[in-house]
């Protein structure tokens, strides 16, 4: 697993809708793979974390003033949709094929 | 200043190009306002941190399992360009009006 010492990467995060209170409106699936972005954004930032210029600058400043400026952060840079079945206001089970932004497709340093 | 206990926000970060070793090719400015995104992404995530659905989900999972899942991270969500005078490969001073992605325009929870 990607701990604090490992580089920024996508790791598994199974989310149960009951745990977050969303089972009141999402009927199915009961859980899904959300993924999580974990790990550090260490110097030098590799291409696979697709750093912005600002992230590169912040990394260099952190290197010089580690107590004053934080490292860039490992976050989702691209998200994917999932499909969900929910009950609409008429009580009709309805399928939303593309419930956007629910699952991590890519992680990067920002 | 925005410490760990404060909410995600844009804070000042003056970057001196000499400090990061970029003074070898950037002639001017000597320094610029890069800004930094600082602070926590606490529940409930406010509209002004423009959370993605994934960030909202991760925040809710963190609330239930704080040791297992991290909070969403406060990062630049929109960047602005700066203008720089630099030496090109022929040593000719050249003005780049829009050197993209160098300064934070907006911060958010991702």
């Amino acid at each position: 697993s990607a701990g604090a010492g490992s580089h920024c990467q996508k790791t598994s995060l199974r989310v149960n809708f009951e745990d977050i209170g969303w089972d009141s409106w999402i009927i199915a699936p009961k859980e899904y793979e959300a993924y999580e972005c974990k790990g550090g954004c260490f110097f030098p930032l590799a291409d696979d974390v697709t750093p912005t210029k600002h992230a590169i600058v912040q990394t260099l400043v952190h290197l010089k003033f580690p107590t004053k400026v934080g490292k860039a952060c490992c976050v989702p840079t691209k998200l994917s949709p999932i499909s969900v079945l929910y009950k609409d206001d008429m009580g009709v089970p309805t399928l939303k094929y593309h419930y956007e932004g629910m699952s991590v497709a890519e992680c990067g340093c920002r | 200043s925005a410490g760990a206990g404060s909410h995600c926000q844009k804070t000042s970060l003056r970057v001196n190009f000499e400090d990061i070793g970029w003074d070898s090719w950037i002639i001017a400015p000597k320094e610029y306002e890069a800004y930094e995104c600082k602070g926590g992404c606490f529940f409930p995530l406010a509209d002004d941190v423009t959370p993605t659905k994934h960030a909202i989900v991760q925040t809710l999972v963190h609330l239930k399992f704080p040791t297992k899942v991290g909070k969403a991270c406060c990062v630049p969500t929109k960047l602005s360009p700066i203008s720089v005078l630099y030496k090109d490969d022929m040593g000719v001073p050249t003005l780049k009006y829009h050197y993209e992605g160098m300064s934070v325009a907006e911060c958010g929870c991702r």
Epitope: P29, E31, V92, T94 | -
Partner: antibody, heavy 118, light 111 residues
Framework: QVQLQQPGAEAVKPGASVKLSCKAS????????MHWVKQRPGQGLEWIGE????????NYNEKFKSKATLTVDKSSSTAYMQLSSLTSEDFAVYYC???????????WGQGTLVTVSA | DIVLTQSPASLAVSLGQRATISCRAS??????????MNWFQQKPGQPPKFLIY???NQGSGVPARFSGSGSGTDFSLNIHPLEEDDTAMYFC?????????FGGGTKLEIK
């Protein structure tokens, strides 16, 4: 409340056609698919096809493609199914039923009994 | 087409006992983590009534005595405790693919 109103019965001669109606009320007609289901006396249920009232798009069971034609009249919130070249095999109760893109049939009409006899 | 095989074709169960009806699909009804299986109850002279959807979720106004379970190709409908009013035909239906198909039905009688 949601209602799907169908005539109780239609008597048709063999070889003729019949147009069955299903008048919807209590919801926005264009929001949900309308399906048609056949049930022969004492038998099971057969899905004939579905129509999207918002754009008239249809999906048919291959078995009924040359038998049934689904249409809608948005102005009157009514769905229609035309059955052609009727034979004794078409003697059945025909239900209209409303559902979403998920395909579960939540609300049903009372059904129209189609009798085919000379 | 997806074929749904219901069993038994008929059963008689005592009042207050449990009735279990099975439905097997010719291929998996799961997609996107959702099971596209529904159950209906039909009484003589009436249209079918929507009981269970997505394998295990009760339709509006359906008593808690009715429960569904299963995934993939094997599904079941449970009724417990059985009441007099539960005498009816029960049908499973898949909504994963066109054409939508139904099981052959199970006739439930109270002993």
């Amino acid at each position: 409340q949601v209602q799907l109103q169908q005539p109780g019965a239609e008597a048709v001669k063999p070889g003729a056609s019949v147009k069955l109606s299903c008048k919807a009320s209590g919801y926005t007609f264009t929001r949900y698919w309308m399906h048609w289901v056949k049930q022969r006396p004492g038998q099971g249920l057969e899905w004939i096809g579905e129509i999207n009232p918002s754009n008239g798009g249809t999906n048919y069971n291959e078995k009924f493609k040359s038998k049934a034609t689904l249409t809608v009249d948005k102005s009157s919130s009514t769905a229609y199914m035309q059955l052609s070249s009727l034979t004794s095999e078409d003697f059945a109760v025909y239900y209209c039923t409303m559902g979403s893109n998920y395909g579960g049939f939540v609300y049903w009409g009372q059904g129209t009994l189609v009798t085919v006899s000379a | 087409d997806i074929v749904l095989t219901q069993s038994p074709a008929s059963l008689a169960v005592s009042l207050g006992q449990r009735a279990t009806i099975s439905c097997r699909a010719s291929e998996s009804l799961d997609n996107y983590g959702i099971s596209f299986m529904n159950w209906f109850q039909q009484k003589p002279g009436q249209p079918p009534k929507f009981l269970i959807y997505a394998a295990s979720n009760q339709g509006s106004g359906v008593p808690a005595r009715f429960s569904g379970s299963g995934s993939g190709t094997d599904f079941s409908l449970n009724i417990h405790p059985l009441e007099e009013d539960d005498t009816a035909m029960y049908f499973c239906q898949q909504s994963k693919e066109v054409p939508r198909t139904f099981g052959g039905g199970t006739k439930l009688e109270i002993k």
